[in-house]
């Protein structure tokens, strides 16, 4: 493309009309950079109607009409077959509803990559205020029958923002219940197809999907998942020289077993981390140690990060970030950063400590006026010390917090109601 960005193609299936516009995630943003092409693209339109591929079409204007894209009765149309074009697609309300019906009745009529596209496009269109957030959420209902990696990954990555915004609020209970309901069949599918987790799926995508199934099932309270990871970890604790956990599953099993466990599990993992000879294995354990749900354990771990004899200096930032990614550790790290900024800056300012990543991570969940105030105060209090590589990140964090506040205000009530109704 010879101009910035990409288009969203809007389809009106009642008339067969296509239109294109420059896709902007933030509808309030102004594009100041002019384009000699006026943000109009030549778009290759591939499509399927009711599961059957149609002839290709080129959209060369802002608007065009073609009977390829008009439907009647229960027919639906889907654009950008196998996502070969770099554009998003929005439909009229009726076509969205028909696509959702098709997905829930027989999702195999829609190619796997398009099932992911439908989810991803809808969440982005909701962010851009083009469709209601409930439409994007409705597009995840079919996942109860989905076994493929890409659609699940599209949903989980979109919902990760919802988790960040709501995992400290009353929305999180119904959200967890919904995800638990949706992921349980996927979890059982992999349990049955891997001889109770003793084998690994042959297909690489299925291997990824298995990891998603375990991490989503465990983090959303599927009891059998919690028992499975705790059991595997206990086996390892009983025989430390023989790790029974397949390398594919280690990150997620370690993390969830430590989250479920207490001091004993944590201390064992710490010991294994200290004795690890493979960097890869050490990194998995170091990240998993931040998964504990015990505040005092996380606090102790946080203190370890500033002791180079325990955590290497070059690993300090990523370890602190792992702790802040844990909702229980987030407040802890923010207090720590506010109280120790001067020391952090003076001790680590010249080295590999990434202030930018740290500020970005510790403020990711910020979505209240109080947190915005705290952030502004933090900026004011440390102006003299400075923020080094984190200066730009701090400005971005202030902007992002404002955007988060606005998003939560707009969506919290709707999302709470939707998850409550759909987790039954």
């Amino acid at each position: 493309t010879l101009q910035m960005g990409f288009p969203v193609i809007t389809v009106d299936t009642s008339t067969g009309t296509l239109s294109q516009e420059h896709f902007l995630l933030d509808p309030d943003s102004n594009v100041t950079r002019p384009s000699e092409f006026n943000y109009v693209w030549i778009v290759p339109i591939t499509s399927i109607r009711d599961g059957r591929q149609q002839q290709d079409y080129w959209l060369i204007d802002v608007r065009a009409q073609n009977d390829l894209f008009s439907t009647s009765g229960n027919e639906w149309v889907l654009l950008n077959l196998n996502v070969t074009g770099y554009y998003r697609v929005n439909y009229d309300e009726e076509n969205w509803r028909k696509i959702q019906t098709q997905l829930q009745r027989d999702h195999s009529a829609i190619p796997v990559i398009n099932r992911a596209q439908i989810i991803n496009d809808a969440f982005n269109l909701a962010s851009a205020h083009k469709v209601p957030v409930t439409l994007a959420l409705n597009n995840t209902l079919f996942l109860i029958e989905e076994r493929q990696y890409m659609p699940w990954e599209a949903a989980l990555s979109s919902l990760s923002y919802f988790k960040l915004m709501f995992d400290r609020s009353e929305v999180y209970g119904p959200m967890k219940n919904y995800l638990k309901k949706q992921v349980t069949p996927l979890f059982i599918h992999f349990r049955n197809n891997t001889n109770n987790w003793r084998e690994i799926p042959e297909n690489l995508m299925d291997q990824y999907s298995e990891v998603n199934a375990i991490s989503t099932a465990c983090s959303n309270g599927v009891p059998e998942c919690e028992e499975m990871v705790s059991g595997l970890f206990k086996q390892w604790m009983e025989n430390p020289n023989n790790n029974p956990i397949h390398p594919n599953l280690r990150s997620t099993v370690y993390c969830n077993a430590i989250a479920q466990g207490g001091e004993e599990e944590w201390d064992f993992a710490w010991e294994q981390f200290r004795n690890a000879t493979l960097v890869n294995e050490a990194d998995k354990l170091r990240a998993a140690l931040a998964c504990s749900k015990e505040l005092w354990i996380l606090n102790r771990y946080l203190s370890y990060t500033l002791n180079p004899d325990l955590i290497r200096k070059q690993d300090a930032t990523s370890t602190i970030i792992s702790i802040t990614n844990n909702v229980i550790g987030q407040g802890l790290v923010w207090d720590f950063v506010q109280s120790n900024w001067k020391k952090l800056f003076n001790d680590y300012g010249g080295g590999s400590f990434s202030f930018s990543n740290l500020i970005q991570a510790v403020t990711r969940r910020f979505s209240t006026e109080y947190e915005l105030q705290q952030l502004e105060q933090f900026k004011k209090d440390n102006e003299e010390t400075g923020f080094g590589s984190g200066t730009r990140a701090l400005e971005q964090a202030l902007e992002k917090t404002k955007a988060n506040i606005k998003w939560v205000k707009e969506n919290k009530e709707v999302v709470l109601q939707w998850f409550t109704e759909n987790s039954k």
Epitope: P27, A126, H129, K130, P132, V133, T134, L135
Partner: nanobody, 128 residues
């Protein structure tokens, strides 16, 4: 700040027609369901018609069915109520309302009295 401004009311003879408009501002109009309610003197506010966010779902009260048509223009942030074959019993103040909780429009049927976002009313009088 969500704002709704209804207009188009007036005095009309029985059998006549009126078209009410309601302009929305301060919110993402195109992702909300919109509806019309009315309140006759001494009576409770009652549901008249509703339309989903994209316009493909419409709902009517029994008294409005066949005579009234609800439509919307998302480009103009406006919802309309075309009223034909008006009767004296249609005399009321007509209010428009917005609902983001159920963008498909069914919220107006289930819990019309719980809608938070009401517009200013417009008076419709049907009399000879």
């Amino acid at each position: 700040q969500v704002q709704l401004q209804a207009s188009g009311g007036g005095l009309v003879q029985p059998g006549g027609s009126l078209r009410l408009s309601c302009a929305g501002s301060g919110f993402t109009f195109s992702t909300y369901a919109m509806g019309w309610f009315r309140q006759a003197p001494g009576k409770e506010r009652e549901f008249v018609a509703a339309i989903s966010w994209g316009g493909s779902g419409t709902y009517y009260s029994d008294s409005a069915k066949g005579r009234f048509t609800i439509s919307r223009d998302n480009a103009k942030n406006t919802v309309y109520l075309q009223m034909n074959s008006l009767k004296p019993e249609d005399t009321a103040v007509y209010y428009c309302a917005a609902d983001k909780l159920r963008p498909n429009g069914t919220g107006f049927l289930a819990r019309g009295t719980m809608i938070e976002t009401w517009g200013q009313g417009t008076q419709v009088t049907v009399s000879s």
